[in-house]
């Protein structure tokens, strides 16, 4: 058993049929010595008396808010949550496996630049009685500070018969050094509590590996005289690290119709302009990637050909 | 060339070669990018590699103030990785294809380090750790880790030379 926060405790349980459970001793936070009784949740049934209460925690019915009273007055509370371990593996019932970039990916994180700011998100089908708390650091043995905000519900989607909820959190490294080569990964830890179930999820990454630039901005077309060709130009996204002579991007320019199966024109360039062949009813799209490190491509920025 | 005394390197040449190094480092093992090597635990294997750190003056402002600190750091790293790529880790079993990008990567590391330090001048170099994995699978894992680390190192070096070529070239 360990303390998650004031008056909230997590009991770690091996979860299998007829498991003996865990013996837990609760102590009433009071100078009083006698006349103390214990109840669980809203029940008025007295579970025991005295300053301490010893219970055998085996299942969710044994978890909940234990309260000690004296003469009708509440003295203190202890909330017990359960953390299940099945076949040596901690349960992951609360969050959905996003399976990208690999199986058992519950947290996904992205950064728009090298400033040390990043966003993580996760998915769940649970809509109520759900709380998250997020902590982060650079490195684990001698951790350096990363400050995370509160996790918020950022999207709701319908998937078949189910509703899916996306939560996200923004974090910022306290003393970021955008130009340095990272040697210690960022660690992100998410505590998830659904009713009386506790789970924790972690992710470890270098900012450089989660970089995904915003799409290029200000796409413009200039038809070339006596030619089917069009010069397309664009600018670096505002959110990308500066100076651009240092933090350089490379680009992919593509001309394609509405369907992915249609013929297309495609060219890669380090410049902020390219010459392509435009067709009626097609669009010109441009996306960006770090020039020197193969992290994710941005989403496409597009303009119609006509 | 970046002489320890302080003259400027051939920024444009360094830029071209460092960008080539980036391409080669990813070609040498593109799949490395999809392996989460941190799960493999034995951190000490690549902890000893030289990293370009915050105080090394490799940021745009530091380069403007005095690029020598940064260039020395990059030079140290290039020599270090060049030795690693020439070591038993990469020459032992399982043997690499004669024409794998690792060979070109090795040569290009040497080429860039020579651009930065002409004959007869010496910056102190970091000792290469004695990593001699006994099993082929350990060697393979170590190669992945070294290449992954090299990808990060050459990315910073390439940014330095790109910025230098754009803003510090005579």
């Amino acid at each position: 058993i360990w303390e998650l926060k004031k008056d909230v405790y997590v009991v770690e349980l091996d979860w299998y049929p007829d498991a003996p459970g865990e013996m837990v001793v609760l102590t009433c936070d009071t100078p009083e010595e006698d006349g103390i009784t214990w109840t669980l949740d809203q029940s008025s049934e007295v579970l025991g008396s005295g300053k301490t209460l010893t219970i055998q925690v085996k299942e969710f019915g044994d978890a909940g808010q234990y309260t000690c009273h004296k003469g009708g007055e509440v003295l203190s509370h202890s909330l017990l949550l359960l953390h299940k371990k099945e076949d040596g593996i901690w349960s992951t019932d609360i969050l959905k496996d996003q399976k990208e970039p690999k199986n058992k990916t519950f947290l996904r994180c992205e950064a728009k630049n090298y400033s040390g700011r990043f966003t993580c998100w996760w998915l769940t089908t649970i809509s109520t009685d759900l709380t998250f708390s997020v902590k982060s650091s650079r490195g684990s043995s001698d951790p350096q500070g990363v400050t995370c905000g509160a996790a918020t519900l950022s999207a709701e989607r319908v998937r078949g018969d189910n509703k899916e909820y996306e939560y996200s959190v923004e974090c910022q490294e306290d003393s970021a050094c955008p130009a340095a080569e990272e040697s210690l990964p960022i660690e992100v830890m998410v505590d998830a509590v659904h009713k009386l179930k506790y789970e924790n999820y972690t992710s470890s990454f270098f900012i450089r590996d989660i970089i995904k630039p915003d799409p290029p901005k200000n796409l413009q077309l200039k038809p070339l005289k006596n030619s089917r060709q069009v010069e397309v130009s664009w600018e670096y996204p505002d959110t990308w690290s500066t100076p651009h002579s240092y933090f350089s991007l490379t680009f992919c320019v593509q001309v394609q119709g509405k369907s992915k199966r249609e013929k297309k024109d495609r060219v890669f360039t380090d410049k902020t302009s390219a010459t392509v062949i435009c067709r009626k009813n097609a669009s010109i799209s441009v996306r960006a990637q770090d020039r020197y490190y193969s992290s994710s491509w941005s989403e496409w920025a597009s303009v119609p050909c006509s | 060339r970046a002489v320890p005394g302080g003259s400027s390197p051939a920024w444009t040449q360094c830029q071209q070669l460092s960008q080539k190094l980036c391409t080669l480092a990813w070609s040498a093992h593109p799949l490395v990018g999809h392996m989460d090597l941190r799960e493999e635990g034995d951190e000490e294997t690549t902890n000893d590699v030289p990293h370009i750190q915050c105080g090394d003056g490799c940021d745009p402002q530091g380069l403007r103030d005095n690029s020598q600190f940064c260039l020395q750091r990059i030079h140290q790293g290039l020599i270090f990785y060049e030795k690693l790529l020439g070591s038993d880790i990469f020459t032992g079993e399982p043997s690499l294809l004669p024409d794998s990008p690792v060979g070109q990567l090795h040569a290009s590391l040497l080429g860039l380090s020579q651009l930065l330090q002409p004959e007869g001048h010496h910056w102190e170099t970091q000792q290469i750790p004695s990593l001699s994995p006994s099993q082929p699978w350990q060697r393979l894992l170590l190669r992945f880790k070294i290449l992954r680390s090299l990808q990060a190192f050459v990315a910073v070096a390439a940014r330095v030379f790109a910025h230098g070529a754009a803003t510090l070239s005579p």
């Epitope: 089917r228 013929k263 024109d265 495609r266 060219v267 380090d270 062949i277 067709r279 | -």
Partner: antibody
Framework: EVQLQQSGADLVRSGASIKLSCTAS????????MHWVKQRPEQGLEWIGW????????EYAPKFQGKATMTADTSSNTAYLQLSSLTSEDTAVYYC???????????WGAGTTVTVSS | DIVLTQSPATLSVTPGDSVSLSCRAS??????LHWYQQKSHESPRLLIK???QSISGIPSRFSGYGSGTDFTLSINSVETEDFGRYFC?????????FGAGTKLELK
């Protein structure tokens, strides 16, 4: 299966013109760019140009401007290359290509050998 | 026009050897470079697109890398069916141009 059937070998007199055909099967040429590439005996490859059969748009390599004319007939699913004022320099194998992507060649015809005699 | 220089012009190898073919562009072309194989009396066929992207149906012993001006096609353990000519082609700008080719022959 995506295939390109090119017209047979031809022997033509210097100064004459010739029209080569390239008929597609297994796909509609409107959905592809059609290119022509020249290869002289024991030599490299030279790009002549492309046509978009959907709208008739064309682009030629400067070297072949005035020498080559590309057309396409979507009803017969065929692309054509006309070569005019033939000289011995035009003796070559001419390949047609069908390309989903404009700038590289993924489906090649078997080629048509053109021999120009004086 | 962008000029592509291939080297060597001829490469004599024994089956089982691994080889590298080089293609150099007269100016930077990012990764807009493609590789073709042409066997005797056959049409060329696409091996690699955009410097390093594999093509379905092409054996995995063919791989490419490079960007900017220097590109390499590698064949890991040459097989007898690999003998022929290899061309690089740039798609950075029109006119599209090819290298003169490297002939891979039996030693």
């Amino acid at each position: 299966e995506v295939q390109l059937q090119q017209s047979g070998a031809d022997l033509v007199r210097s100064g004459a013109s010739i029209k080569l055909s390239c008929t597609a099967s297994g796909f509609n040429i409107k959905d592809y760019y059609m290119h022509w590439v020249k290869q002289r005996p024991e030599q490299g490859l030279e790009w002549i140009g492309w046509i978009d059969p959907e709208n008739g748009d064309t682009e030629y390599a400067p070297k072949f401007q005035g020498k080559a004319t590309m057309t396409a007939d979507t009803s017969s699913n065929t692309a054509y290359l006309q070569l005019s004022s033939l000289t011995s320099e035009d003796t070559a194998v001419y390949y047609c290509n069908a390309c989903k992507e404009l700038r590289y060649f993924d489906v090649w015809g078997a080629g048509t050998t053109v021999t120009v005699s004086s | 026009d962008i000029v592509l220089t291939q080297s060597p012009a001829t490469l004599s190898v024994t089956p089982g050897d691994s080889v590298s073919l080089s293609c150099r562009a007269s100016q930077s072309i990012s990764i807009n470079l493609h590789w073709y194989q042409q066997k005797s009396h056959e049409s060329p066929r696409l091996l690699i697109k955009f410097a390093s992207q594999s093509i379905s149906g092409i054996p995995s012993r063919f791989s490419g890398y490079g960007s900017g001006t220097d590109f390499t096609l590698s064949i890991n353990s040459v097989e007898t069916e690999d003998f022929g000519r290899y061309f690089c082609q740039q798609s950075n700008s029109f006119p599209l141009t090819f290298g003169a080719g490297t002939k891979l022959e039996l030693k």
